[in-house]
Interface confidence: low
């Protein structure tokens, strides 16, 4: 039985050209995390594997940095980075938990007047 829950940074906004940290946290389970996948829509961004460590997808190597922790840092943001991001926790024995984050990348002038989204 899957008892865990994923807490995420929820809906967030960031400034074009800046960077953002995507964070998920798995709680309320004693299951062992074997791997965390970070995906954007249908694209794999990065993997953090408990034994093998981090691997960043080659097409994102220049703009994605591992961490902090099991999170992911996106750099040099563009408007095209707007969209859904998923953290997928592979665990044993529970199985797979998925968290969702929506990122909106704003033009500088808009971002300066405050985020449109609040972190819940």
């Amino acid at each position: 039985m899957m008892t865990g829950t994923i807490e995420t940074t929820g809906n967030i906004s960031a400034e074009k050209g800046g960077s953002i940290i995507l964070q998920c946290h798995l709680s309320s389970t004693t299951a062992q995390v074997t791997q965390v996948n970070w995906e954007q829509q249908d694209q794999l961004l990065a993997i953090c594997n408990a034994d093998l460590g981090w691997h960043i997808s080659p097409s994102f190597k220049d703009r994605v940095a591992p961490g902090p922790g099991l999170g992911l840092t996106l750099q040099s943001l563009t408007v095209n980075d707007t969209g859904e991001y998923f953290c997928i926790y592979h665990t044993y024995p529970d199985g797979t938990y998925t968290g969702r984050i929506f990122l909106e990348v704003l033009e500088s002038s808009v971002a300066e007047h405050g985020a449109r989204f609040q972190i819940p």
Epitope: T34, Q35, N37, E39, L44, I47, N49, D51, L52, G53, H55, P58, I88, H90, Y92
Partner: nanobody, 125 residues
């Protein structure tokens, strides 16, 4: 620490068979996809075969129908059964481990993070 140790290489005549083994230690084997790669003298390393999550397999065109990849999860061993060997199969064969993920079962070596030391296969009369 994850370790991969290959064995089973050697000298074989054209048309002959060999079975390579790769003993894996230091992690929960079922979490990973595993692959065999080879590097012939003076050539770049190339993918041979992989066995991925759910038991899916893939083979390079040059070995399809001749080689069979399999694994024994209870013993943490990966196998490559090589039949109808040709001179062009001569190479050092490497076992490699890659993280499980939701993508295709492919032979892109950039995804493989852990490598064995290799075992030499020589096909010659």
């Amino acid at each position: 620490e994850v370790q991969l140790v290959e064995s089973g290489g050697g000298l074989v005549q054209p048309g002959g068979s060999l079975r390579l083994s790769c003993a894996a230690s230091g992690y929960k084997y079922g979490v990973y996809s595993m692959g065999w790669f080879r590097q012939a003298p003076g050539k770049e390393r190339e993918g041979v075969s992989a066995i991925c999550s759910g038991g899916r397999t893939t083979y390079s065109d040059s070995v399809k129908g001749r080689f069979t990849i399999s694994r024994d999860n209870s013993k943490n061993i990966l196998y490559l059964q090589m039949n109808s060997l040709r001179a062009e199969d001569t190479a050092v064969y490497y076992c490699a481990a890659r993280p499980l993920w939701t993508g295709d079962c492919d032979l892109s070596s950039s995804w493989y993070k852990t490598w064995g030391q290799g075992t030499l296969v020589t096909v010659s009369s």
